[in-house]
Interface confidence: low
């Protein structure tokens, strides 16, 4: 689509005569009829196939025609066409005399024609005017012409339609040749594809407008390059969505089972050595001078009651010292200078002579002990605490401080390993003497039924259009990661494509 423009500049009819040679009375009131048609080697009558236009009376006899001349006419004259400009044309310009105001062909006398020119040739689309002058015996016409494209039409023959737009169907302006030039942030043949945020992951991210980065299911982060681990994953990471790969020292389906209590909690005190002995279980090996499950208690050397026969123990920097009662001597007061005659047995103990009276032995009543029945029986002496429990004197009673995994007054009861429900995915727990055992349901295996073996939501290939399938372990369902151009829970729907365009 375009416009053939004709600019009439000057018409000379000095004698004021018609084509017949007859003079106009009082002068030739001149208007023009223009006929534009397809190229003819010899311009002949017939339809003005490219269009026609008439002017009002522009002047009398000889006159110059100004741009956009008065009297309601337009200069240049416009001959619009709605087809591909063929590059060739024929042009007929007739000058007519108007005796009255009615310029219709049927209202004019047949001899009202002043002059008629006909040209034909090639004409390329362009802004430059071609100047021409046609002279006959009595008249001269100077004019110029050109062909330009209508709005939204481009190219050598005005056949390329391009309308700038900024909507769902495209975001572009038109170049001089009619090709599209995408607005910033858009790309693709019709500039419909937004350019996502720089660095936005090609597969895991997408965008609906420029500089955006929206993550597909299972991905997160500004650039959608961080996978989302399994829901509830505590001390683990992922390399693909919904994984839970445990960090060093952690185990279990959600990596919440502590396999390295020593490192994570440093329970052993006073420089003791810690050894992991299972989930949340450890053993402290104390340095000399310390005791307790966590080696938190400072050990006095007198605590082992090294002094015999009622000797009293005194702690010293480099050990201990026994103060012996009368009749005894030796490092631990183990040697006696007494006999039964000296009544050495205290607290109602009975004395028995030995070695022909050179020695004796005391038989103590209940609750007393020692070589002279001088000691009240220590409630912990019999080491009543089972399973490595530590005995503590507390007033008239005694208490056992149990090691992890044991309970009861004397640490005689095994804590049920099943109390913590360690079997995943509905496994059944059985307490054993040295631990526990899980009986797993169909589809799971492993020490804690944490390994999925057969039920796999992705096994049936539920995702369409080459989408990637991920199994959500917590719900036994799948998630489809769609490739570009598809949506839906199974990536079954293509994103709506734009209608075709005329160019």
């Amino acid at each position: 689509s375009g416009v053939f423009q004709l600019q009439l500049q000057e018409f000379i009819n000095e004698r004021g005569v018609l084509a017949s040679g007859r003079p106009c009375e009082p002068g030739c009131r001149t208007f023009f009829r223009v006929c534009l048609k397809h190229f003819q080697a010899v311009v002949s009558p017939g339809p003005c196939t490219f269009g026609t236009v008439s002017t009002p009376v522009l002047g009398t006899n000889s006159f110059a025609v100004r741009d956009d001349s008065s009297g309601g006419g337009r200069n240049p004259l416009q001959l619009p066409f709605n087809f591909t400009w063929p590059g060739t044309f024929s042009l007929i310009i007739e000058a007519w005399h108007a005796p009255g105001d009615d310029l219709r062909p049927e209202a004019l006398p047949p001899d009202a024609l002043i002059s008629k020119i006909a040209i034909q040739g090639s004409l390329a689309v362009g802004q430059n005017w071609l100047l021409d002058e046609q002279t006959s015996t009595l008249t001269r016409l100077r004019y110029s012409y050109r062909v330009i494209c209508s709005d939204n039409y481009y190219g050598d023959n005005c056949s390329r339609l391009c309308k700038k737009r900024n909507d769902h169907f495209g975001h572009y302006v038109c170049q001089p040749d009619g090709n599209l030039s995408c607005l910033p942030g858009w790309t693709g043949e019709y500039c419909q594809q937004p350019i996502c945020l720089s660095g936005c992951h090609e597969q895991n991210g997408y965008c609906s407008k420029p500089a955006e980065c929206l993550c597909r299911p299972g991905w997160q982060g500004r650039l959608c390059n961080e996978c989302i681990p399994h829901n509830g994953c505590r001390h683990g990471t992922c390399s693909t969505p919904w994984q839970c790969t445990c960090d060093e020292g952690w185990g279990g389906l959600f990596c919440d089972q502590d396999l390295n209590y020593c490192t994570h909690h440093s329970p052993c005190k006073n420089g003791a050595t810690c050894s992991n002995s299972g989930q949340r279980s450890y053993t402290c090996t104390c340095r000399p001078g310390y005791t307790g499950v966590d080696c938190e208690l400072e050990l006095s050397e007198c605590d082992s009651n090294p002094c015999r026969n009622g000797g009293s123990c005194k702690d010293q920097e480099d050990g201990y010292h026994c103060l012996c009662p009368p009749g005894y001597y030796g490092l631990h007061c183990e040697h006696s200078t007494l006999s039964c005659a000296d009544s050495p047995c205290f607290n109602g103990g009975s004395c028995r002579e030995r070695n022909q009276g050179a020695n004796y032995a005391c038989e103590c009543p209940p609750n007393f002990t020692g070589s002279n029945c001088e000691k009240k029986v220590d409630r912990c002496t019999s080491n009543p605490c089972a399973n490595g429990g530590q005995c503590l004197n507390r007033g008239p009673s005694r208490m056992c401080r149990c090691r992890p995994g044991f309970t009861g007054t004397y640490c005689e009861l095994h804590v049920s390993d099943c109390a913590r429900n360690p079997c995943a995915h509905g496994g059944t727990c059985h307490d054993l003497e040295n631990g526990l055992m899980c009986t797993c349901p169909a589809g799971f295996s492993g020490r804690r039924c944490e390994v999925r073996t057969s039920i796999d939501a992705c096994a049936s290939s539920p995702c369409f259009n080459r989408a990637t399938c991920y199994t959500d372990l917590s719900t036994d369902t799948f998630v489809c990661n769609c490739p570009y151009g598809f949506v839906g829970s199974r990536c079954e729907f293509p994103v709506g494509l734009p209608p075709s365009f005329p160019w």
Epitope: H38, P47, T49, G51, T52, F81, N82, P86
Partner: antibody, heavy 114, light 107 residues
Framework: EVQLVESGGGLVQPGGSLRLSCAAS????????ISWVRQAPGKGLEWVGV????????EYADSVKGRFTISADTSKNTAYLQMNSLRAEDTAVYYC???????????WGQGTLV | DIQMTQSPSSLSASVGDRVTITCRAS??????VAWYQQKPGKAPKLLIY???FLYSGVPSRFSGSGSGTDFTLTISSLQPEDFATYYC?????????FGQGTKVEIK
Amino acid sequence: EVQLVESGGGLVQPGGSLRLSCAASGFTFTDNWISWVRQAPGKGLEWVGVINPNSGATEYADSVKGRFTISADTSKNTAYLQMNSLRAEDTAVYYCARDNFGGYFDYWGQGTLV
Amino acid sequence: DIQMTQSPSSLSASVGDRVTITCRASQDVSTAVAWYQQKPGKAPKLLIYSASFLYSGVPSRFSGSGSGTDFTLTISSLQPEDFATYYCQQSYNGPSTFGQGTKVEIK
């Protein structure tokens, strides 16, 4: 004298094919475009397609696109309409017409019934 | 595609009557409209092109007018040979489309 003469019409089963010819005379064949226009019995006129014999460029109505093909032999001053996968609704009188640059049909053939 | 709607679809008139047929385009078609006359068993004949230009050899009682979306074909004084079906056609944009036709019958 400008003349357009169609031939090749006839009876054909649905799904069948037919080729119509349009022999032109009295004007420069390569300087003009040739259109095919059809008219179903008792109905109005429907433009089918057009060819520029000089370049071979063609355009088609959506209703026939992919099934009909227009071609021209400039040595014989003849345009052709090849019709494939014919349907009952293609039943019509087919006219060829000279399509001048304004897009108007100034000369028509007598028509051929398909 | 651009739709061309003609009215009336048929009319009865007598010789000498002034007859007007209208055609409305579904969108602006400038002046790219032609009118044709068709008699039974014959090919259509061009009467008017570019909305208002009389084709050579066509009697001057036929005239056309309009631009944009509304167009009119007028027969100033109906003659016996004018009883026929008349079609409008646009060639402005996209595929060329015709009106559905107006049948002019003898009253």
